[in-house]
């Protein structure tokens, strides 16, 4: 799967994690911090 | 299935002010920016600005600062694009874009005209 | 703002021909471009997105290059049902589009 860094306009999606555009699936998509979930990392879990 | 729908047409007299809806159907707005770009009659597409519901933080164009405000209400999952100080050249489609995970989706448009 | 410069405004091709039209940006956009088709009337469609990348349903005579600041969009092969105007979009930093290209038969 081929990826690169998500477009300066999304800056501040991922709340709690890295954005990252996986180039094949035409998606950005949110790699989430230990602890985060959600589309946008938004929900703290324990 | 996801969409996007859009308030009907309005008309408005110069000086008035223009309140446009956008109600997301089928996905959560506070996943996603929603976008809005306006076309006038015969002319080319405009990006007006956009508004992370989740952050609720807006950017807007510079042309369009102080005039435009885009507000979104998460517990309907509407968003809302209002113009003040209408003149003539503010006739146009306005379209709602939504953009985030997936590239963009364009709901069907309003069409705003003003005259006297 | 990044600026978005399209090229030709309009332009008139044969059957069978291929077209190409240009986007230059007034800085790199890292490949962040789309590309857009309006016919009169309708909503745009949204025809290439990541300079290259197409869309679901888009025949394969559309196509999309570049990098940096510089990016053409190609129809191999333009059909008389791709009569409208096509729309570049920069989407790395806020949006700006292009002032479109007007395609007409000969």
């Known amino acids: 799967v081929s990826i690169t860094k998500c477009n300066s306009d999304m800056n501040g999606y991922c709340l709690h994690g890295q954005c990252i555009y996986l180039v094949d699936m035409s998606q950005n998509y949110c790699r989430c911090e230990v602890g985060y979930t959600g589309v946008r990392c938004e929900h703290f879990y324990l | 299935q996801d969409q996007l729908v859009q308030s009907g047409a309005e008309v408005k007299k110069p000086g008035a002010s223009v309140k446009v809806s956008c109600k997301a159907s089928g996905f959560n707005i506070k996943d996603t920016y929603i976008q809005w770009v306006r076309q006038a009659p015969g002319q080319g597409l405009e990006w007006m600005g956009r508004i992370d519901p989740l952050r609720r933080q807006t950017k807007y164009r510079e042309k369009f600062e102080g005039r435009v405000t885009i507000t979104a209400d998460t517990s309907t999952n509407t968003a809302y694009m209002e113009l003040s100080s209408l003149r003539s050249e503010d006739t146009a489609v306005y379209y709602c874009?939504?953009?985030?995970?997936?590239?963009?989706?364009w709901g069907q448009g309003t069409l705003v005209t003003v005259s006297s | 703002d990044i600026q978005m410069t399209q090229s030709p405004s309009s332009l008139s091709a044969s059957v069978g021909d291929r077209v190409t039209i240009t986007c230059k940006a007034s800085?790199?956009?890292?490949?962040?471009i789309a590309w857009y088709q309006q016919k009169p009337g309708q909503a745009p469609r949204l025809l290439i997105q990541?300079?290259?990348t197409l869309q679901p349903g888009v025949p394969s005579r559309f196509s999309g290059s570049g990098s940096g600041t510089d990016y053409t969009f190609t129809i191999s092969s333009l059909q008389p049902e791709d009569i409208a105007t096509y729309y570049c979009?920069?989407?790395?930093?806020?949006?700006?589009f292009g002032g479109g290209t007007k395609v007409e038969i000969k």
């Open positions: 979009l920069q989407y790395d930093n806020l949006r700006t």
């Open positions: 990541y300079t290259s």
């Open positions: 800085q790199d956009i890292h490949k962040y």
């Open positions: 874009v939504r953009s985030g995970r997936e590239f963009d989706y």
